[in-house]
Amino acid sequence: APVRSLNCTLRDSQQKSLVMSGPYELKALHLQGQDMEQQVVFSMSFVQGEESNDKIPVALGLKEKNLYLSCVLKDDKPTLQLESVDPKNYPKKKMEKRFVFNKIEINNKLEFESAQFPNWYISTSQAENMPVFLGGTKGGQDITDFTMQFVSS
């Protein structure tokens, strides 16, 4: 069955925007004015996932690119990556678990927990111009809260 999707940008709670850093990495930094056009536009889709009260399973693709955020083990550590997919087959309702994030939405703040690695979250560093990564701590130095902005076509 078809599912809903939307186009959005994400900023961390310090208002850092997400931009491409090379072909398969995102970084977070403060942008202003025309530089805001560098922001990555996500295509966020509702997908099938495990049931939990305030968690909504989503996939995060890059709009009009065949790239999705995914979570895999690298050197025995849960790692966030941009993964290339066959555009003929994606997005789909039953996404592989590595592509699924549990969106937790409280007071207009969003967290994205990896479905593959519970309690690991899409995170940014306090520092400028650092990679977006999968972090295993909440409420520490690293930032796990984001705001979402709809993108007009």
Epitope: P2, V3, N7, Q48, E51, K103, E105, S152, S153
Partner: antibody
Amino acid sequence: EVQLVESGGGNVQPGGSLRLSCTASGFSLSNSAMAWVRQAPGKGLEWVGIIYDSASTYYASWAKGRFTISRDNSKNTVYLQMNSLRAEDTATYYCARERAIFSGDFALWGQGTLVTVSS
Amino acid sequence: EIVMTQSPSTLSASVGDRVTITCQASQSISSWLSWYQQKPGKAPKLLIYKASTLASGVPSRFSGSGSGTEFTLTISSLQPDDFATYYCQNAGGGVSIAFGQGTKLTVL
């Protein structure tokens, strides 16, 4: 106070058009998913459609082609454009905010505006 | 498209009674089921989401259960304020959203 107020309802002849407005106060509509739900007199609730960003709108099958949802973030307002109206479109039309993106449920509702299609 | 079917259509009960309303989905919707209360001339009010989670400010006498295609709304001890019409609705991010036809709860 956080609230939604619908306006634009009234009497319209069959085949006519009407545009309903839903204006938010106490919060910004710009990043809220907004739906329209209608209720014919003495009948049950019927989902019309929902808008996320302006390119991402979804409709009940019966509403596709005749009804269009749009938004003007600068006015903190969402619209429902209704064309080729029929007697069976007579209803109270509510706008509602999705509780969380893709939750598919609605925690904040307006008071409704009545549309009567009659010659 | 999903069809939601509620039963009964009308239900008469007395203050203090335990009442149960059922809702059936035409296909599995996992736990994506919400319940609303509506009083005459008023907008619906969200009671329960994700089949069993109480919405903010809703009294604990309301509870929901079920998954897949079969769901129930239970009011453990009916209060005068509870006489209203109740609707179930499939939720989540599927393209189609549908409400049940409603259950009118009246005083016996």
